[in-house]
Interface confidence: low
């Protein structure tokens, strides 16, 4: 139904707390350089205005669209051009072009310092003094660094953060209570960020149809007892929610997500037997829980997939009459039978099936032509299965850090032109797949590994788009989203790359490395490893291992030395010489 005042409608639906949180996220994601105080001021102004519209929907400007209201607020910020350059040009446009322009200026890799967590005492003090401001800072800092973070989910993580602080700040040993819990939330939030960015990329690059196909596959795996009409309804609703969030319509997105959660909980009987626990929770927890609910038990009596999609004499007729519905049904039926496959793989199979029908239904004897299609799926299925086996074996042998290093060497050889910080970030993220997925039961490994890798590689593509330097990466990033991971896996050493000359300063270290946290030390070592590979792209694994072992030994020795500075100054050049010799 149409509302006289959109802003009043959303304020009433969401309530003041969520309304303010979402407006803060929206502003922080659009204008990523502004301080918390600047955004907090705008949020207060918008909230005050929304309240006047709730009181009287006919009040001045209450009938304006949210884009108009928010855009006008952003464009009224002083010094917009000085701080944001050409983003200020967006303000010369009318809606909806103005909002599109803002979206195009979102920066996936803003030059902001890493979000540092204060030490426990300081954190608890500021949390106790003003919990609302504390959580506002959290939303602002995360949102500006992750401009496509799924807004209602960010509210959920803020709520988690709040609960952890409430609990741990009452403990004697705050530090040991907070650290593991907040690390857990951070890890989950970062994964959520790359997954959502992948969804927005799918929507932006390939449109709603592509996202809806993803949703059909995912929902069919989770709810194999729901019929095709139910899955289609859920996929349509989910597509709308994600389209809104990816488009910056965060109030609508959160509102529609709450509606979808409500619908699912009211229709459990036709969706899944596993929803009740989620449906007992309050809103944010409920929606989060539903988004990662365990798969329902598969019906025992499912017929073979071949019956309707290969053996049926009407295959070409059914396909011609309603292509999207027929292919959607195929995707639904195949996905509900295969919770052990990744969504990417299921979409590749559906694409292969579509291509086969396109070709075969134009021939004289279609059944003879498409009769072998399921057998032709085999290599497509084997490739990711082998990928999982090989990589999980390697992870189990090397551990997370060693596995990250193996990936770093591999990817630096594939795309040596990519900047070292990007390669290190990508390898560290890709390497976490081991810890995340390889410990899962066999039937959950493939979907976990491949869908996670796809999301990480999407980030690699986004960063590379800003400054394209590698033809290899451009080639893999230009194709369809579901083909990216196989494309990257198939890349080999870039033969056109001319190695970097050896610069001693790249491999020169000082005693300050000794006091760095373990993670920072690892990044320093991995940076050196990537630079070594750029210098010698065809170095063997043994050569690189020799150098890295020597490097680790050098750090260990000098960091334990009484006079660290002298040790680094004298042993450093020797290390550089040994490295050059080892690689010669």
């Amino acid at each position: 139904e149409a509302h006289k005042s959109e802003i009043a409608h959303r304020y009433n639906d969401l309530g003041e707390q969520h309304f303010k949180g979402l407006v803060l996220i929206a502003f922080s994601q659009y204008l990523q350089k502004c301080s918390y105080d600047e955004h907090a001021k705008l949020v207060q102004e918008v909230t005050d205005f929304a309240k006047t519209c709730v009181a009287d929907e006919s009040a001045a400007n209450c009938d304006k669209s949210l884009h108009t209201l928010f855009g006008d607020k952003l464009c009224a910020i002083p010094n917009l051009r000085e701080n944001y350059g050409e983003l200020a040009d967006c303000c010369t446009k009318q809606e909806p072009e103005r909002n599109e322009c803002f979206l195009q200026h979102k920066d996936d890799n803003p030059s902001l310092p890493p979000f540092e967590r204060p030490e426990a005492e300081a954190m608890c003090t500021s949390f106790k003094e003003n919990p609302t401001t504390f959580m506002g800072h959290y939303l602002h800092e995360v949102a500006r660094r992750h401009p496509y973070f799924y807004a209602p989910e960010l509210l959920y993580y803020a709520e988690q953060y709040n609960e952890i602080l409430t609990q741990c700040c009452a403990e004697a040993d705050k530090e040991s209570c907070l650290t593991p819990k907040l690390d857990g939330v951070k890890e989950k939030a970062l994964v959520s960020s790359v997954r959502q960015r992948m969804k927005c990329s799918s929507m932006q690059k390939f449109g709603e149809r592509a996202f809806k196909a993803w949703a059909v596959a995912r929902l069919s795996q989770t709810f194999p007892n729901a019929d095709f009409a139910e899955i289609t309804k859920l996929a349509t609703d989910l597509t709308k929610v994600n389209k809104e969030c990816c488009h910056g319509d965060l109030l609508e997105c959160a509102d529609d997500r709450a509606e979808l959660a409500k619908y699912m909980c009211e229709n459990q009987a036709t969706i899944s037997s596993k929803l009740q626990t989620c449906c007992d929770k309050p809103l944010l927890k409920k929606a989060h829980c539903l988004s990662e609910v365990e798969h329902d038990t598969m019906p025992a009596d499912l017929p073979a997939i071949a019956a309707d999609f290969v053996e049926d004499q009407e295959v070409c007729k059914n396909y011609a009459e309603a292509k999207d519905v027929f292919l959607g049904t195929f995707l639904y039926e195949y996905s509900r039978r295969h919770p052990d496959y990744s969504v990417s793989l299921l979409l590749r199979l559906a694409k292969k099936y579509e291509a086969t029908l396109e070709k075969c239904c134009a021939e004289a004897n279609p059944p003879a032509c498409y009769g072998t299609v399921l057998a032709e799926f085999q290599p497509l299925v084997e490739e990711p299965k082998n990928l999982v086996k090989t990589n999980c074996d390697l992870y189990e042998k090397l551990g997370e850090y060693g596995f990250q290093n193996a990936i770093l060497v591999r990817y630096t050889q594939k795309a040596p032109q990519v900047s070292t910080p990007t390669l290190v970030e990508a390898a560290r993220n890709l390497g976490r797949v081991g810890t995340k997925c390889c410990t899962l039961p066999e039937d959950q490994r493939l979907p976990c590994v491949e869908d996670y890798l796809s999301a990480i590689l999407n980030r690699v593509c986004l960063l590379h788009e800003k400054t394209p330097v590698s033809e290899h990466v451009t080639k893999c990033c230009s194709g369809s989203l579901v083909e990216r991971r196989p494309c990257f896996s198939a890349l080999t050493v870039d033969e056109t790359y001319v190695p970097k000359e050896f610069k001693a300063e790249t491999f020169t270290f000082h005693s300050d490395i000794c006091t760095l946290p373990e993670k920072e030390k690892q990044i320093k070592k991995q940076t050196a490893l990537a630079e070594l590979v750029k210098h010698k792209p065809k170095a063997t694994a043994e050569q690189l291992k020799t150098v890295m072992d020597d490097f680790a030994q050098f750090l260990d020795t000098c960091c334990k030395a009484a006079d660290k500075d002298t040790c680094f100054s004298t042993e450093g050049p020797n290390l550089v010489t040994r490295c050059k010799d080892a690689l010669a």
Partner: nanobody, 123 residues
Framework: EVQLVESGGGEVQPGGSLRLSCAAS????????MVWVRQAPGKGLEWVST????????RYAESVKGRFTISRDNAKNTLYLQMNSLRAEDTAVYYC????????????????WGQGTLVTVKP
């Protein structure tokens, strides 16, 4: 025996043009990536441009982008470098080079080189 013979160098005024050629023999030219590298007087080697075997991948150093064009003719086993808008800082010996087959480590030592051709840009 692998042979790379550069030609086309010479003296030219700033803003002028030259076309360097590199005749290759003794290896499978049509399946080899090729590079142009230069060495200015008293300086180290500097990569200029890369072209893949099928010429689909072409890359240039920032310093020459928009001014130099690399190309190849696989039928003639010849590599080219068209140099326009030449500047004083382009003065160098220009070498064409290719990876040694089967080389495990990729550094300049692992390339086959020509003898170079001198390009001098002065008013």
């Amino acid at each position: 025996e692998v042979q790379l013979v550069e030609s086309g160098g010479g003296e030219v005024q700033p803003g002028g043009s030259l076309r360097l050629s590199c005749a290759a023999s003794g290896f499978a030219f049509s399946t080899s990536g090729m590079v142009w590298v230069r060495q200015a007087p008293g300086k180290g080697l500097e990569w200029v441009s890369t072209i893949s075997d099928d010429a689909r991948i072409i890359r240039y150093a920032e310093s020459v982008k928009g001014r130099f064009t690399i190309s190849r003719d696989n039928a003639k086993n010849t590599l080219y470098l068209q140099m326009n808008s030449l500047r004083a800082e382009d003065t160098a010996v220009y070498y064409c080079a290719t990876y040694r087959a089967g080389s495990r480590i990729g550094s300049y030592e692992d390339y086959y080189w020509g003898q170079g051709t001198l390009v001098t840009v002065k008013p």
